[in-house]
């Protein structure tokens, strides 16, 4: 094949190979962007920035190589439109550092930095960390920083990400009120913070004020809805991110509903509660006080994070006769109290009837396995009597 | 498949508390199942001592209630009865097992009340 | 009364059928569950809840009940039901649990 005359010629299927000395100033306008996977520049001395606008369009691009170039700065989001990123080579360079932002949001297998004038500073103590976990292929570069000795020598005590404070009121919150939430940040270097409020919806009314450091939350007219809802502050220095959750009790009163008895491998009365703080649960059977035995029992379903209503059941292992009745549940707590009846028949009598009287109808047995709870049946091929009710 | 083992001392002297656990494993004691001891005194019949549910629920055969304490650690994934005040009368084979079937039992563990 | 009453001792001839009782008066109210045990060996669940048997179980074990009498049937016997058998159940007031005396089998 006949040599490429271009400032970038093709290589491979999908790549770009980009070799002519001072050919390049900026990567607008590739040919072929779309496609390529692998790129590959060297010599490019006027090649110094590389930022967000540059790699747009790249989005199937998983090696960079840029060497023995000029290349200054690299942009906190230069890689935000190259996800798939897994090898970056930015050996000889004129590098004195990298922001950790620009390699966040990457799964990189391969960081080449060896080469470059690196500063040792703040800054780079996250590739200082990645240095003494072995990320990334930089333990074998044995970085070093311009007149300074090794990257892993770099003092690293006062390096710390924002430290986030985050005062909640101490008070009860109830339904309607306005909420002030504070966020105090520490830390050197502070370059951005703010609050993370995607959970909220409509849980309440949003005003933001204040800025570093000290950002301010208004949620006015909170419903209860706001409970188990994450409300984060976060904060952005040289070495890092910081992120606090909290979470506001909205308080509001117990209550309570009772859906008709299924059988499943057991008798299950649903149920749900919900109010906050959680109420107390009580039963009442036939309106006395209903003592939970491994026969009978409360049985919660796993609760979901972010919402305060629990499920469950009253659950009942193979209830005759004598669990017929009006089931009650009771719920409280500081804020109110609800109760909820219903009425459950499991069998008539199968103990006791009159030979002359239509055979009953038996619920028939469920094949169960023992990781439920109930031992493994074997079912029966042989119809049994009227009178067979035990066992 | 669930496993049950009984643990803990095989002599106590009278007037002490006897001490057993039971490990679960195969299962999660957490799960919808409450668990159980019984107790079987040489050549004798078994008797039921107590049952427990993961959230603390417990219930005791009266005729033990004052002297049994039956608990449960998640983190173990075993529970554990206490029995005060022991006399000849609580030697016994003790089991523990899954209730309320008792479709899984513990090999059983001999529990001496000896001075 | 928080009692199931067993007789002591039952004896069947190899293949015949023999029927085992639990009396109490917490039997008209629960169902009773059947263990049968071995020397030297943990009680085995052989019947349960409304006539339900564990796997593993053979069907010529099988439970039945009338008033305040549980019985476990045993049709065929083999030699390998020689054993003590024990009935439990529910006590009246629901809140504990009671077991019979026990019923030892002997197969001739």
């Known amino acids: 094949a006949a040599p490429c005359p271009d400032a970038c010629c093709p290589h491979g299927s999908s790549g770009l190979r980009c070799t002519r000395d001072g050919a390049l100033d900026s990567l607008h306008h590739l040919p072929g962007a779309e496609n390529l996977t692998e790129l590959y520049i060297e010599n490019q001395q006027h090649l110094q920035h590389l930022e967000l606008r540059d790699l747009r369009g790249l989005g199937e691009l998983r090696n960079l190589t840029i060497v023995k170039s000029g290349l200054r700065f690299v942009a906190p989001d230069a890689f935000h439109f190259t996800p798939r990123l897994s090898r970056l080579n930015l050996s000889f360079n004129a590098l004195e550092s990298l922001s950790w932002k620009t390699v966040q949001g990457l799964s990189l297998q391969e960081l080449v930095l060896s080469g470059n004038p690196l500063h040792c500073s703040c800054a780079l103590r996250w590739l200082q960390r990645w240095e003494e976990e072995g990320l990334g292929g930089v333990p074998e570069q044995k970085l070093q920083c311009h007149g300074q000795g090794p990257l892993a020598h770099m003092p690293n005590a006062s390096c710390g990400v924002p430290t986030l404070k985050v005062q909640v009121p101490n008070a009860s919150v109830d339904v309607g009120d306005d909420v002030l939430l504070r966020c105090q940040v520490e830390g050197r270097g502070l370059e951005q913070a703010g609050w993370i409020l995607t959970e909220l919806e409509q849980s309440a009314t949003v005003m933001k004020s204040g800025g570093l450091p000290s950002l301010g939350l208004t949620l006015a007219n909170v419903t209860s809805d706001l409970n188990r809802k994450n409300v984060t502050c976060w904060a952005e220095n040289d070495v890092g991110r910081a992120e606090v959750s909290v979470q506001v009790n909205v308080s509001f009163p117990a209550s309570v509903q009772l859906h008709t008895a299924v059988e499943m491998h057991h008798w299950c009365i649903p149920f749900s509660v919900d109010g906050q703080p959680a109420p107390s649960l009580r039963w009442l059977f036939n309106g006395s006080v209903l003592n939970e035995t491994s026969f009978i029992f409360t049985e919660f379903l796993e609760p979901a994070a972010n919402e305060t209503v629990r499920h469950g059941c009253l659950r009942l292992n193979q209830p005759t006769h004598v669990n017929n009745g009006n089931y009650t549940l009771l719920a409280a707590n500081p804020f109110g109290q609800a109760s909820a009846s219903i009425m459950a028949a499991f069998m008539d009598n199968p103990f006791e009837f009159n030979p002359e009287d239509p055979i009953p109808v038996s619920f028939s047995p469920v094949d169960t396995n023992s990781t439920s709870g109930d031992p493994v049946e074997k079912k029966d091929e042989t119809p049994f009597g009227v009178s067979v009710a035990v066992g | 498949e669930v496993q049950l083992q009984e643990s803990g001392p095989g002599l106590v002297k009278p007037s002490g508390t006897l001490s057993l656990t039971c490990a679960v494993s195969g299962g999660s004691i957490s799960s919808s199942n409450w668990w159980t001891w019984v107790r079987q005194p040489p050549g004798k019949g078994l008797e039921w001592i107590g049952e427990i549910y993961h959230r603390g629920n417990r219930n005791y055969n009266p005729s033990l209630k004052s002297r049994v304490t039956i608990s449960v650690d998640k983190s173990k994934n075993q529970f554990s009865l206490k029995l005060s005040s022991v006399t000849a009368a609580d030697t016994a084979v003790y089991y523990c097992a899954r209730a309320p079937w008792f479709d899984y039992w513990g090999q059983g563990t001999l529990v001496t009340v000896s001075s | 009364s928080s009692e199931l009453t067993q007789d002591p001792a039952v004896s069947v001839a190899l293949g015949q059928t023999v029927r085992i009782t639990c009396q109490g008066a917490s039997l008209r109210s629960y169902y009773a569950s059947w263990y049968q045990q071995k020397p030297g060996q943990a009680p085995v669940l052989v019947i349960y809840?409304?006539?339900k048997r564990p796997s593993g179980i053979p069907d010529r074990f099988s439970g039945s009940s009338s008033g305040n009498t549980a019985s476990l049937t045993i049709t065929g016997a083999q030699a390998e039901d020689e054993a003590d058998y024990y009935c439990?159940?529910?006590?009246?007031?629901?809140?504990?649990?009671?077991f019979g005396g026990g019923t030892k089998l002997t197969v001739l």
């Open positions: 439990n159940s529910q006590a009246s007031s629901g809140n504990h649990l009671i």
């Open positions: 809840g409304k006539n």
